[in-house]
Interface confidence: low
């Protein structure tokens, strides 16, 4: 079998034990609480082992090398990076009971940045209180083989390059591996070496194809506008440099005095129409992207954008037409935090003449429509070259209006 562990585009967990250890030996005297969490691959939530802060157990373990495996590898042999002794590789068989009973020590998540230049691994220690008192270092050893031979493949130690991971926040370290564009489809082999208080934790060999783990940059240019048919159009553009189509997750919340609506939609286009929009409401929207047709990682969410609708919404907001034609305006009217029922809406032209009720239509409970038939040319009124069409609540008209140019 292939001795390297294939990384999926998810968070995964590293569990460690001293060589030749048994369950009873494993750090239990030092205050580690037993744990019976399952191994079903849900790695997002991790139970934090509890250590006493005296450090006595660490001094006992000084110079010990802990060999680590991934939770999903319980019943497999687990290969380690090349060891110091003559460049040979250890393959350790691990008792699966250990993994059922002892929760893991590290969460690891890796991805290729959206610019396709840097492969990043975040190594998060679950010994939250432990490493503040110890000299904590994380190194990532990696190799991009020129030619991948048949499995099993374990490069010799000398062929690995090492990067020092940035652990400015002690519990979370960032390891950056530069990947040439020409090698994005190649298999990257790597392993982690974590040192703390003289104890070395060593991961198994991991393999990954960077192109399958792209985390795009967040979508750009998120904006919203009301369409001529009264929908809210949410639009954005895909981030630059992504070499494949993306799917997008759009989450938006609508907040008005009458309703709070939240939605979460997956789309492959760079826009989304939201219907039944309400006047006097605010819409907060965020969007993120992920590879459409293969494995990948969701980008971070874009910066939230907020769009606020007016108390009176006209759609379309203006119409330009020719003499003799028929046109319609729609309106939704909100007054004193209530949406005016459409049957109570009246329409006025230029606040001077009431439009006959025969020209009204009730489209829905809240949407009123007025239609103009066989239109005459607009007569200029001072500097105004259009007719102002007002949607009113009985005798009270909002200052906003729609514009009719004939």
């Amino acid at each position: 079998f292939n001795l390297s562990y294939p990384i999926t585009p998810w968070r995964f967990k590293l569990s460690c034990m001293p060589p030749n250890s048994t369950y009873d030996y494993f750090l239990l005297p030092a205050g580690l609480s037993k744990n019976t969490s399952n191994s079903n691959g849900h790695y997002e939530t991790a139970v934090e082992p509890k250590f006493n802060s005296s450090g006595t157990h660490f001094s006992n373990l000084s110079k010990t090398t802990f060999h680590c495996c991934f939770r999903s590898e319980q019943d497999r042999n687990c290969s380690l990076c090349a060891d110091n002794i003559e460049g040979k590789t250890f393959v350790s068989t691990v008792n699966s009971l250990v993994f059922q009973q002892i929760d893991a020590n590290w969460n690891i998540q890796c991805w290729l940045k959206g610019d396709l230049k840097l492969f990043i691994c975040y190594v998060e220690s679950l010994f939250k209180n432990l490493f503040r008192n110890y000299n904590y270092k994380v190194h990532l050893l990696y190799v991009l083989p020129e030619v991948l031979e048949d499995s099993p493949l374990v490069p010799q130690k000398g062929s690995f390059q090492m990067v020092h991971c940035n652990c400015s926040v002690h519990e979370c370290c960032e390891c950056l591996v530069p990947v040439p564009t020409a090698k994005l489809n190649d298999t990257l082999l790597m392993c982690l070496k974590i040192t703390s208080g003289g104890v070395i934790f060593q991961s198994p060999l991991m393999s990954v194809q960077p192109i399958n783990m792209v985390k795009p940059d967040p979508p750009l240019g998120l904006h919203m506008e009301i369409t001529d048919d009264g929908n809210l159009k949410i639009s954005w553009s895909s981030p630059p440099l992504v070499p494949f189509p993306l799917q997008y997750q759009v989450k938006y919340s609508e907040n008005s005095t009458t309703v709070i609506r939240e939605a979460d939609k997956i789309v492959s286009a760079t826009s989304l129409l939201v219907d039944s929009i309400l006047p006097g409401s605010s819409y907060e929207v965020q969007v993120r992207g992920k590879r459409l047709d293969g494995p990948g990682i969701w980008s971070d969410w874009s910066t939230p954008r907020v769009f606020t609708t007016q108390d009176v919404i006209y759609f379309p907001p203006k119409i330009l037409t020719s003499v003799g034609s028929n046109v319609s305006f729609h309106c939704i009217y909100k007054k004193e935090n209530k949406i005016v029922p459409s049957k109570e809406i009246v329409w006025w032209m230029n606040l001077a003449e009431k439009i006959p009720q025969s020209q009204y239509d009730v489209v829905s409970d809240h949407v009123s429509k007025v239609t103009f038939f066989n239109l005459n040319e607009t007569k200029p009124r001072g500097k105004f070259t259009y007719d102002a069409v007002y949607c009113c609540n009985e005798h009270e008209c909002h200052h906003r209006y729609a514009e009719l140019y004939v």
Epitope: D217, L220, H223, S235, T303, P317
Partner: antibody, heavy 117, light 108 residues
Framework: QVQLVQSGPEVKKPGASVKVSCKGS????????ISWIRQAPGHGLEWMGW????????RFAQKVQGRLTMTTDTSTSTAYMELRSLRSDDTAVYYC??????????WGQGTLVTVSS | DIQMTQSPSSLSASVGDRVTITCRAS??????LNWYQQKPGKAPKLLIY???SLQSGVPSRFSGSGSGTDFTLTISSLQPEDFATYYC??????????FGQGTRLEIK
Amino acid sequence: QVQLVQSGPEVKKPGASVKVSCKGSGYTFSWYGISWIRQAPGHGLEWMGWISASSGNTRFAQKVQGRLTMTTDTSTSTAYMELRSLRSDDTAVYYCARTGTRPFDYWGQGTLVTVSS
Amino acid sequence: DIQMTQSPSSLSASVGDRVTITCRASQSISSYLNWYQQKPGKAPKLLIYAASSLQSGVPSRFSGSGSGTDFTLTISSLQPEDFATYYCQQSYSTPPITFGQGTRLEIK
């Protein structure tokens, strides 16, 4: 190709208004917004405001809010910028710029507005 | 409002030189940064959008980098037509959209 063509230079007295037009061609006018940006002589760029060509939605810089009116006419693919109560420090070249997912990717040639008594 | 500060305000260089202009935002703007070139009497021209993406038609000697608060525009090998004023601009937090004060690039 995408082009934005602006109206010609204007000379105005303090307190007057000026209206500058910007005609777009080579793209679907209603799919984009138009921003107005000005540049006083020897100075940098100052964003004034933005209008969505499809919905008429607007955003303003605080400095000109209340004096600036932006409109669009999608039938002629033209955007208009009107600045009222002109002062001498409004003397500048006024630019329109197409504003989509890549802000200001195409610009008009600029319109010099001189405010002088 | 987010302030954009460019440095230097002006610099002199020769044809063939490698030139770097920096732009700093008063708060993090992610990658929502654009670079423009303006020649005397002309409208600005978009060079780089989203911090590092080259606008179509712009020569590859122009490149942008950075994210968060610190950004750079690099011209790898100056050509005679590159002498101009360069502006950075953020579109992260709007309104208002804000520009840097400009960097004037002159012939040495």
